[in-house]
Amino acid sequence: KLLQVSTIAMQQQEKLIQQERALLNFTEWKRSCALQMKYCQAFMQNSLSSAHNSSPCPNNWIQNRESCYYVSEIWSIWHTSQENCLKEGSTLLQIESKEEMDFITGSLRKIKGSYDYWVGLSQDGHSGRWLWQDGSSPSPGLLPAERSQSANQVCGYVKSNSLLSSNCSTWKYFICEKYALRSSV
């Protein structure tokens, strides 16, 4: 009889442990759902506020045609500049035409005056060829005016209305570029 009672007690205890485990799993699941919900709401709010603002470029970016430009307020070496742009979902400026160059240099004159700004141009150490960051070659009129006498890696920058070259490890401002959002209206 005593053995029967202790067996029943053990079974009840086992059932209780299973229920506790199930409750714990449910609580964990509920917490996970709440967290997912929070992320979802944040995402929706971001999307809605973006749609509501419907500005083709983010705040503090300049628009020209299909592009948005960000002129940095900090100095960094070329590689760090590249990473700073990536954090904003953009790349270092790639100048496609004389018109774009004129727009950039005109805007810089208005904003900051005659400083140095890294762009997404670098010189291949082996061939000496200048290439944009996507691997394309600059048009002949958009090659840096002077060849830097540096044993280190050489990168391109804009100053006044010229494209120049310098050791990539020097500190300069930088310009990021991304596509402007198309208006859906």
């Epitope: 944040a42 990536l86 954090k87 979902g89 953009s90």
Partner: nanobody, 115 residues
Framework: DVQLVESGGGLVQPGGSLRLSCAAS????????MGWYRQAPGKQRELVAA???????TYADSVKGRFTISRDNAKNTVYLQMNSLRPEDTAVYYC?????????WGQGTLVTVSS
Amino acid sequence: DVQLVESGGGLVQPGGSLRLSCAASGRIFSVNAMGWYRQAPGKQRELVAAITNQGAPTYADSVKGRFTISRDNAKNTVYLQMNSLRPEDTAVYYCKAFTRGDDYWGQGTLVTVSS
């Protein structure tokens, strides 16, 4: 947080090809760009290639014309197609997610180019 899982590394002969994959999960809406870095023994970690959410790529000089970065938004995956591999491409390749705040790294996948 953002979790990143790399795959596709291995041993390949000089001149051969490999395709690396990096699958992202978690708070992926905060990610603005994805990139591949590499670190060879005794060297600093360097950016190999990256791609923004808008699909704009960027490459290191040493891999231009040989490597191609791409992304599949439906699968939340970024790929690095590596062609004409050289012994100097041997390294651990890491995937990185760029956000305005923290940056997130994968655990790395080893690529060995040797005959």
